[in-house]
Each structure stands twice: as C-alpha cells, then as structure tokens.
C-alpha cells in the first residue's frame, strides 16, 4: 500500500562496528523523506532521524542501552513536503529491518598494538583496550568491559627474517611470549569471539616490528 508518489525503503542493512551502529537502506529519495523507528522485541517504538533525506540513520544511542537485546527497526516513507500524507490503508509506507543483536553481531573493529617490551628472551605485547560507545554509570566501557572473557586476542608473531607466523592467544589484553635473543620480531593481533559462528574475527591490526618506536628493549 502507500501513496503513488512514495516508494518503500528496501535493502535495510545494519552496519555495526564495536557497537557504533547505523541502519542503511535504499533508494536515494526522490520527492520523499524517511523516518526510522527502533524497538526491542518487547518494547515500544522510538522514532529517530525524522523526515530525513539520508539513507542511513545512526541508532547507536538506542542499541547501547542494552547490547544483549534484539532490536528491530523500520523505515517509513513520506512524500516530501506532505509528511502528514498516508497510504491508502491510512498509514505511511514502511519496511522492516532484519533483527539485530549487537552483542552477537557487531563487527569487531581493527585492534591496535599499544606497546611491546622485550626483557631478555621474553616479549610482553599489549593490545589497546578500545573504548566503545556503551555506557555504564556515565562512563564509556572498553571492548574488554563489554565482552569480558568472551573476547580473545590472537597474536601472530614472526622473525623479520622468516615467513612462518607463530601464534599465541590471550583472554586479557596482554601476551607474554618467548623469543630468540638477538632476533627482531614483527607482531600483528586479531580480535576474536570464539563463541560466535559469524562475525567472529576483526581485521588484523597494523604490523608492528621490533626496532621501531612503539617498542622498548631491555637487555637483562
């Protein structure tokens, strides 16, 4: 249903990384505008992005209230300049999004190696604990705060002179690995949520190598 001069939104897609969550859709509007509503399965609808000509709406503020809830959004189409107009059924045209559960589905952002420190034949590699937009008691939580032990990091490390990538894993943000004395190593990390079946891994962090500024070397 709907008025002849509006078309329903389609290809509603959730784009979410570290809980920053945007709903995208098509088509680019021609003589029409959109309003988005979002709700949990059991909650009331809340309107966002009123009468917009954009084809995306940032819903982060809503989903971070409870990242373990399942959300549904819908996009309403209205004729431009006549937003009171409704479809033939007495309501504006709308399309539903797929369901979205942030905790299970948000993509893991690219991690960053914060530092590495060599002491003799041991290297301590620290991963930056990235801040999210999820809040508790008015403070922003880190990725580790939100996911706890569900989040692990895989470290890939290799001698600068070698192609084989050794691995280590941690459910904290720190690795302590054994290295050969006098060898330079490179490092890259990947965030993983092993309990997931999709969106399990982040992209790899930028590679950091010993002998560059980020690290520290101490001979004992």
């Amino acid at each position: 249903s709907g008025t002849t001069n509006t078309v329903a939104a389609y290809n509603l897609t959730w784009k979410s990384t570290n809980f920053k969550t945007i709903l995208e859709w098509e088509p680019k509007p021609v003589n029409q505008v959109y309003t988005v509503q979002i709700s949990t399965k059991s909650g009331d609808w809340k309107s966002k992005c009123f009468y917009t000509t954009d084809t995306e709406c940032d819903l982060t503020d809503e989903i971070v209230k409870d990242v373990k809830q399942t959300y549904l959004a819908r996009v309403f189409s209205y004729p431009a300049g006549n937003v009171e107009s409704t479809g033939s059924a007495g309501e504006p045209l709308y399309e539903n999004s797929p369901e979205f559960t942030p905790y299970l589905e948000t993509n893991l952002g690219q991690p960053t190696i914060q530092s590495f420190e060599q002491v003799g034949t041991k290297v301590n590699v620290t991963v930056e604990d990235e801040r999210t937009l999820v809040r508790r008691n008015n403070t922003f939580l880190s990725l580790r705060d939100v996911f706890g032990k569900d989040l692990i990091y895989t470290l890939y490390y290799w001698k600068s002179s070698s192609s084989g990538k050794k691995t280590a894993k941690t459910n904290t943000n720190e690795f302590l690995i054994d290295v050969d004395k006098g060898e330079n190593y490179c490092f890259s990390v990947q965030a993983v949520i092993p309990s997931r079946t999709v969106n399990r891994k982040s992209t790899d962090s930028p590679v950091e190598c010993m002998g560059q500024e980020k690290g520290e070397f101490r001979e004992i």
Partner: antibody, heavy 120, light 107 residues
C-alpha cells in the same frame, strides 16, 4: 552440520608431490583457522601446519618446512596441503581440523583423514 | 617447542573402573590443554578443552583437571565404548604439540 572432508591421498613415489584438499561445509573457513595433523601408521598425532584464511598466515612443523605449503580458497571454502619432495617418513593419514581460536586452541572438528603412502 | 609427556603409554582396565591419564607440559601452558579420544581408523574426537571443560555431547564421566603444568584426564566409570587411545594437546603457542597417547585396553 559442520563437516571437513579430505581428499587427494594415495601412493606417491619418494621425491614426488601430492596435493590434499580439505573441503569444509556448515561453516566458512575464513572465520576459523585450519590445521593439518598427520598420523604415521601405529604412531601418535603430529601437527603439520596451519593457515588462517582471513589473512593467509601460515606456519609449519620443522619436519615439513620448505617442502609443504598450506593454502586456502575461501570462495571454495577449501584448504589445501601441497606436499613436495616426499619421503618415506611422510607416510601417514593426514587430517585437517578446525581451530575455533579459543584461548585453549582446541580442534573441535576433524576430517575423516586421507592416507598418503610414500613408497617406490 | 613445548613437550607434552603423557603417561602411561597403555593401561588395561575393566568396565566400571576409574581411569586416570596424566600429561606434563615442559613449561607453563596456562589452561591451554585439550584431550582427545581416538578409535582405530577414525579421526580424533575432542573430549575436554581449556584443561577442565567438557566438550558438548561428551558424557559426564569424563573430566579434566590441572595442577601447575600437570594435566589429568579421568574416566570415572569406564564404559565399553571408552576403550580407545587418548591424547593430550597443548596449544598455548605454536606449534601445538600432542602427548604420545595412552591406549586403554580391556583387561
């Protein structure tokens, strides 16, 4: 249902080559790490190497380094083990296994195995 | 490389017996140890992960524990289908290494 199916085994001459395939279904290999593990007749399990299909990273046991190469084709959801310069001591059942990348690094699913016999 | 020393290499037991298999890591591996069961002509099957967690679908008579670098697999009451070879594995770091295996045979 998660499944790993190896193929490509058989009799190979010493010094020869063989390519094994590990076809995955029920999950996408991009999201996991795939290992190859072998077992010589009547012997224990020996790790051969791994690939992370999301970045192409690999590593190998010292016993096969320089002779074996692991690759993956994510569009076919398949991992491969290319074995060159084969020796009699490479005779074994070769398994591929899925690593869920948990902290303990367990292999939760294994293929049925394929026998590679290196003999003249 | 981290060595996993498994003992005994074989044991004979009867149905209903309590069976214990141990593995010692040559260095600290935290809890990054798994146990597998393998029957002749078959692929290994995961029993225990993270030293003490029972994998889904595995009977509760199997359990795992850790004390420092010593790891134990216990079968509380051996069943006919439990006669097999058992392997421990560490994957704290690459390369993952396996114990030599313990063959559990019928007495």
């Amino acid at each position: 249902e998660v499944q790993l199916v190896e193929s490509g085994g058989g009799l190979v001459q010493p010094g020869g080559s063989s390519r094994l395939s590990c076809a995955a279904s029920g999950f996408t290999i991009y999201d996991y790490i795939i290992h190859w593990v072998r077992q010589a007749p009547g012997k224990g399990l020996e790790w051969v190497g791994y690939i992370d299909p999301s970045n192409g990273y690999t590593d190998y046991a010292d016993s096969v380094k320089g002779r074996f190469t692991i690759s993956a084709d994510t569009s076919k959801n398949t991992a491969y083990l290319q074995m060159n310069s084969l020796r009699a001591e490479d005779t074994a059942v070769y398994y591929c296994a899925r690593d869920i990348q948990s902290v303990s690094g367990e292999f939760d699913y294994w293929g049925q195995g394929t026998l590679v016999t290196v003999s003249s | 490389d981290i060595q996993m020393t498994q003992s005994p290499s074989s044991l004979s037991a009867s149905v209903g017996d309590r069976v214990t298999i141990t593995c010692r890591a040559s260095q600290d591996v935290n809890t990054a140890v798994a146990w597998y069961q393998q029957k002749p002509g078959k692929a290994p099957k995961l029993l225990i992960y993270s030293a003490s967690f029972l994998y889904s679908g595995v009977p509760s008579r199997f359990s795992g524990s850790r004390s420092g670098t010593d790891f134990t697999l216990t079968i509380s009451s051996l069943q006919p289908e439990d006669f097999a070879t058992y392997y421990c594995q560490q994957h704290y770091t690459t390369p993952p290494t396996f114990g030599q295996g313990t063959k559990v045979e019928i007495k």
